[in-house]
């Protein structure tokens, strides 16, 4: 029962997480105009992965897509790629996990197959979550770098008269949605991996039975040579699980700096 609950909860948490990753990827507010300590403007700028928008105080909002592909900064392309990979892996993971759910019966699918599928989806969710967290973190790092660069050069002009006030950008709502969603997907993936251990079918263990013969006693173990591997947990399934556990630490993100704004 606990295994089913863990698996079901893992699925639901991952589902929410992936929905959040999709939402964050589509959102326009990855970076928003910094309003703190700035002159009050009648125009508010914000940018996403796919387009930049301007909202005027009149209420009119205009968005322009980044119609160029080659002209975009490499870091922005990298963030896009990480988010898309995260969504694709998450979507596949969700599809696999639906069939892996213990509460759903599909034909004569064995528990071992369900365990394998649960583990596979768990790993996919973990990688998906890490991709989202990495993507959002790279973008955030980019913003921080640009923020301090533009703060250093905030006022540019000649003869002491201010000519241009540079627009500074800070973290947008999409970053927080992305971090939370990535974290949820990651947690969901870990829960699926934990559930996999409980789902793994273990071979029946038989205790030794003593038969007392006249003259001398001999202990017989039923199952022939198989008895030698019959004690403890099934090593084949254990190996699969351990392999999955190692996969958790395989994906790493290396944030780098790029002026995208």
């Amino acid at each position: 029962m606990a295994v089913t609950a863990c698996q079901g909860l893992g699925f639901v948490v991952s589902l929410i997480g992936i929905a959040g990753i999709i939402a964050a990827t589509c959102m326009d507010q990855w970076s928003t105009q910094d309003l703190y300590n700035n002159p009050v403007t009648a125009v508010f700028n914000y940018q996403g992965l796919w387009r930049s928008c301007v909202r005027e105080s009149s209420g009119f909002t205009e968005c322009r897509g980044y119609f160029t592909l080659l002209g975009l900064p490499a870091m922005l392309q990298a963030v896009r790629a990480l988010m898309i990979v995260g969504i694709v892996l998450g979507a596949i993971g969700l599809l696999v996990s639906i069939f892996a759910l213990k509460c759903i019966r599909i034909g004569s699918m064995e528990d071992s197959a369900k365990a394998n599928m649960t583990l596979t989806s768990g790993i996919m969710f973990i990688v998906s979550g890490l991709c989202a967290i990495a993507g959002v973190s790279v973008f955030a790092n980019m913003l921080v770098t640009n923020f301090w660069m533009s703060t250093a050069n905030m006022y540019t002009g000649m003869g002491g008269m201010v000519q241009t006030v540079q627009t500074r950008y800070t973290f947008g709502a999409a970053l927080f949605v992305g971090w939370v969603a990535g974290g949820l997907t990651l947690i969901g993936g870990v829960m699926m991996c934990i559930a996999c251990r409980g789902l793994a079918p273990e071979e029946t263990n038989y205790k030794a039975v003593s038969y007392h013969a006249s003259g001398h006693s001999v202990a017989y173990k039923p199952g022939g040579f198989k008895a030698s591997t019959g004690f403890g947990s099934n090593t084949k399934n254990k190996k699969i699980y351990d392999g999955g556990a190692r996969t958790e630490d395989e994906v790493q993100s290396y944030p780098s700096k790029h002026d995208y704004v």
Epitope: V40, T41, N45, S57, V162, T167
Partner: antibody, heavy 118, light 113 residues
Framework: EVQLVESGGGLVKPGGSLRLSCAAS????????MSWVRQAPGKGLEWVST????????YYADSVKGRFTISRDNAKNSLYLQMNSLRAEDTAVYYC???????????WGQGTLVTVSS | DIVMTQSPDSLAVSLGERATINCKSS????????????LTWYQQKPGQPPKLLIY???TRESGVPDRFSGSGSGTDFTLTISSLQAEDFAVYYC?????????FGGGTKVEIK
């Protein structure tokens, strides 16, 4: 047809109060930011205040900050300007205007005259 | 506050001639987000409310004759009336629509020569 009609102007003593109203029609009032602009006799235009469409943000000229309050009633399609602690220099024709593209004031009322004199 | 300086204060022009009015802001009105200049031009005739002519420094309001054109970027802007008509004699104002307070220029009176 877009129409903006101001009312509530008149003669008031210094230190007194007055409430201007602007009745709007012919456009989606609740989705539009609205402004008040004044013009002293024989002088140029002076922006007074702006209120955003959602009533979330209000902006004021330094000369009226703390004395004037802009508000709106979307249900009645009305814009208001509550003027307190009036001074002689507040004497002007007060125009109500709608903000359009580029934050430009694309539609204006005919104005209402406010005279502050003892 | 942003200071809007209009020049000249008044301008005497003959019918059919070109009129040029300048407007200078103390800070750039160019928004980096959409590369648009938030400068607006208005026309005001005696006893009437102002009328919007041009917004985003160069976009004509619908119904405004094409003899009116706006140009400039950053801090320096120009309103040009290519061939003055009798109905164009009025006072013209520029306005900063980028920073609050939304300041107006002092106005330029275009008179018949």
């Amino acid at each position: 047809e877009v129409q903006l009609v101001e009312s509530g102007g008149g003669l008031v003593k210094p230190g007194g109060s007055l409430r201007l109203s602007c009745a709007a029609s012919g456009f989606s009032f609740s989705n539009s930011a609205m402004s008040w602009v004044r013009q002293a006799p024989g002088k140029g235009l002076e922006w007074v205040s702006t209120i955003s469409s959602g009533d979330s943000y209000t902006y004021y000229a330094d000369s009226v900050k703390g004395r004037f309050t802009i508000s709106r009633d979307n249900a009645k399609n009305s814009l208001y300007l509550q003027m307190n602690s009036l001074r002689a220099e507040d004497t002007a024709v007060y125009y109500c205007a709608r903000q359009g593209y580029g934050n430009a004031l694309d539609y204006w009322g005919q104005g209402t005259l406010v005279t502050v004199s003892s | 506050d942003i200071v809007m300086t209009q020049s000249p204060d008044s301008l005497a022009v003959s019918l059919g001639e070109r009129a040029t009015i300048n407007c200078k802001s103390s800070q750039s009105l160019l928004n980096s987000g959409n590369q648009k200049n938030y400068l607006t031009w208005y026309q005001q005739k005696p006893g009437q409310p102002p009328k919007l002519l041009i917004y985003w420094s160069s976009t004509r309001e619908s119904g405004v004759p094409d003899r009116f054109s706006g140009s400039g970027s950053g801090t320096d802007f120009t309103l040009t009336i290519s061939s003055l008509q009798a109905e164009d004699f009025a006072v013209y104002y520029c306005q900063n629509d980028y920073y609050y307070p939304l300041t107006f220029g002092g106005g330029t009176k275009v008179e018949i020569k």
